[in-house]
């Protein structure tokens, strides 16, 4: 049983407006519109949001007023479909408007673009930012919600409100300081990094819902919640997992008002039932709504009960294993996942789900045999290779990260992944490698028992994005193979890929490796991307180049940039030394 109220309301829009309050209501409607129609300007969306809010207020005043009984999808969809020049700007998305609800809303959802062709969200310089923030904080935050939501159409809406609130607090504090720039930059960079991670994690949840349904998501939630709340009983974990599944399903389905409302309800429930959930919730529960829900979502693991019996007792040694499994498969497997997960906060959720899958497959096979206990008696020992594989991955990669640093580690991953899938576009490979490489900074500095869950669950989320981008234009059989399996098998599948032997190397094009003096003035991040683009292209030209050969070329390239960017006449340096560099590269890779 979930915790959510289910009374019917005469007017859904009035109900949500009352529950959420005007500020959150408007923010969520803006996010919804920005995620559906990603090319519209802030002003266009702000106008629609105001119209929807005014209408909601009339329904609050009189729930029987005209159209107040309409569903939110009908109201929002009618607004979106009334936008002028929809076909010119959005092409076939306009066909959604010929459909009836609920097909129309689901048509909009299917047209969300994970990689919209929008320019990167550039942060204005501090002084300008503070001026516009002081002039109109509401409009300023509206722009933030709009710009993030349209670039991340599956961003978890209530969490985006939280990040906007963080943004607001940072600006309020830093804009009062003498040195605004040095106050703002590190703080806003921190929020940006966290928000980007939040985005890929949520996208993975929606992918799970889209491809495998709430059954798969609920299994993920049971494992995750059991790790965090090892003292809660199975019934409590199941209730929380059911509610968390509902909240996420609503957000992934574009039902953002319901999602935010139900998330607040779930946070309230958790805070009212701390005794049966966890001893670590009080600090979170003392915070206001958005901070409270965010805090609960990443609360530290409760202390594990000291007297937990060995997992084998109920799931291997018990004589009734096959009987219990046959009677209620999902419940029995659920209790296995719960019991195993609460004992292993040091494992990734992906690993726990792989173990549960292995256990299920073993029971399916063994319970049909003449002597089941003899057959499934070794199942826990058979988990060992499944556990060792990600542990080795973490050790190898963290050692490499410690040796090379973040940029060098990204380059090592870029070479590896370009060899695995050389047909993938260079910008996608560079983006993926840069994101995968951040795992070092994010996870390798953590205590030993936190590394594995951090590394593997983060890598899985990044690889999900690789799969989504590849789905749009499939070019690599390697990638297709790994992306078409189950979500939990993706990371091991990608890790196991080797050099693609079917690939015909790209011919060497001098212009790919020709650079100009404008590179010298680029910010460090952009310089890195240019160099990594060249590295990926080198590997595409010579997929079997040795690490040593690539290092020679990249060192030479770095030296060339350094020399020419320090030269008095940069343009001449680039035009004379550039061709020499290209020749040396060709020779080094010959």
């Amino acid at each position: 049983r979930g915790v959510f109220r289910r009374e019917a309301h005469k007017s859904e829009i009035a109900h949500r407006y009352n529950d959420l309050g005007e500020q959150h209501f408007k923010g969520l409607v803006l996010i919804a519109f920005s995620q559906y129609l990603q090319k519209c300007s802030y002003d266009e969306h702000a106008k629609l949001v105001q119209e929807v809010t005014d209408f909601a207020k009339t329904c609050v005043a009189d729930e029987s007023a005209a159209n107040c009984d309409k569903s939110l999808h009908t109201l929002f969809g009618d607004k979106l479909c009334a936008i002028p020049n929809l076909r010119e700007n959005y092409g076939e998305l306009a066909d959604c408007c010929t459909k009836q609800e609920p097909e129309r809303n689901e048509c909009f959802l299917q047209h969300k673009d994970d990689n919209p062709s929008l320019p990167p969200f550039e942060r204005p310089e501090a002084e300008a930012m503070c001026t516009s923030f002081k002039e109109n904080p509401t409009t300023f935050m509206g722009h933030y919600l709009h710009e993030v939501a349209r670039r991340h159409p599956y961003f978890y809406a209530p969490e985006l409100l939280y990040y906007a609130e963080q943004y607001n607090e940072i600006l309020t504090q830093c804009c009062a300081e003498a040195d605004k720039e040095s106050c703002l930059t590190p703080k806003l960079d921190g929020v940006k990094e966290k928000a980007l991670v939040s985005s890929v994690r949520q996208r993975m949840k929606c992918s799970s819902m889209q491809k495998f349904g709430e059954r798969a998501f609920k299994a993920w939630a049971v494992a995750r919640l059991s790790q965090t709340f090892p003292n809660a009983d199975f019934a409590e974990i199941t209730k929380l997992a059911t509610d968390l599944t509902k909240v996420n399903k609503e957000c992934c389905h574009g039902d953002l008002l319901e999602c935010a409302d139900d998330r607040a309800e779930l946070a309230k429930y958790m805070c009212e039932n701390q005794a049966t959930i966890s001893s670590k919730l009080q600090t979170c529960c003392d915070k206001p709504l958005l901070k409270k829900a965010h805090c609960l979502s990443e609360v530290e693991h409760d202390t594990m009960p000291a007297d937990l019996p060995a997992i084998a007792a109920d799931f291997v040694e018990d004589q009734e294993v096959c009987k219990n499994y046959a009677e209620a498969k999902d419940v029995f497997l659920g209790t296995f996942l719960y019991e195993y997960s609460r004992r292993h906060p040091d494992y990734s959720v992906s690993l726990l789900l792989r173990l549960a899958k292995k256990y299920e497959a073993t029971l399916e096979k063994c319970c049909a045999e003449a002597n089941p206990p003899a057959c499934y008696g070794t199942v826990l020992a058979e988990f060992q290779p499944l556990v060792e594989e990600p542990k080795n991955l973490v050790k190898t990669n963290c050692d490499l990260y410690e040796k090379l640093g973040e940029y060098g580690f990204q380059n090592a991953i870029l070479v590896r992944y370009t060899q695995k899938a050389p047909q993938v576009s260079t910008p996608t490979l560079v983006e993926a490698a840069r994101n995968l490489g951040r795992v070092g900074t994010k996870c390798c500095t953590l205590p030993e028992d936190q590394r594995l869950p951090c590394v593997e669950d983060y890598l899985s989320a990044i690889l999900n994005r690789v799969c989504l981008l590849h789905e749009k234009t499939p070019v690599s059989e390697h990638v297709t193979k790994c992306c078409s399996g189950s979500l939990v098998e993706r990371r091991p599948c990608f890790s196991a890929l080797t050099v693609d032997e079917t690939y015909v190397p790209k011919e060497f094009k001098a212009e790919t490796f020709t650079f100009h003096s404008d590179i010298c003035t680029l910010p460090e991040k952009e310089k890195q991307i240019k160099k990594q683009t060249a590295l990926a292209e080198l590997v595409k030209h010579k997929p079997k180049a040795t690490a040593e050969q690539l290092k020679t070329v990249m060192d030479d390239f770095a030296q060339f940039l350094d020399t020419c960017c320090k030269a008095a006449d940069k343009d001449t340096c680039f035009s004379t030394e550039g061709p020499n560099l290209v020749t040396r590269c060709k020779d080094a890779l010959a």
């Epitope: 609920p102 689901e106 349904g213 999902d330």
Partner: nanobody, 125 residues
Framework: EVQLVESGGGLVQAGDSLRLSCAAS????????MGWFRQVPGKEREFVAA????????RYLDSVKGRFTISRDSTKNAVYLQMNSLKPEDTAVYYC??????????????????WGQGTQVTVSS
């Protein structure tokens, strides 16, 4: 495998009613949602209504709202579609479908794993 058997179709006059039934049977039956779709020759299969197994949440195509009612009997693994005030444009083959994992989209036929053979509904004017 899951088997779905529909019944209750037939020929009726505009304004009349019909009740379609669909019974699901088979090994390890996991139902998250059951729905009804319909198809007219030469056209795509169209979502009509669906009901979630746990909460009993329902969704209807706008043009059938207020006329059609979907309900379930979880003890019998059955779903029903009560169709009132039928119109000639409701004429189609009606298919029952099961989603066994609770996928995100209600109206996409790819969200459903198992399908019945279909039952013909004809509404004459």
């Amino acid at each position: 495998e899951v088997q779905l058997v529909e019944s209750g179709g037939g020929l009726v006059q505009a304004g009349d009613s019909l009740r379609l039934s669909c019974a699901a049977s088979g090994r390890s039956l996991g139902i998250y949602r059951m729905g009804w779709f319909r198809q007219v020759p030469g056209k795509e299969r169209e979502f009509v209504a669906a009901i979630s197994w746990s909460g009993g949440t329902t969704r209807y195509l706008d043009s059938v709202k207020g006329r059609f009612t979907i309900s379930r009997d979880s003890t019998k693994n059955a779903v029903y579609l009560q169709m009132n005030s039928l119109k000639p444009e409701d004429t189609a083959v009606y298919y029952c479908a099961v989603d066994s994992s609770g996928r995100l989209y209600w109206t996409l036929s790819t969200s459903y794993d198992y399908w019945g053979q279909g039952t013909q509904v004809t509404v004459s004017s």
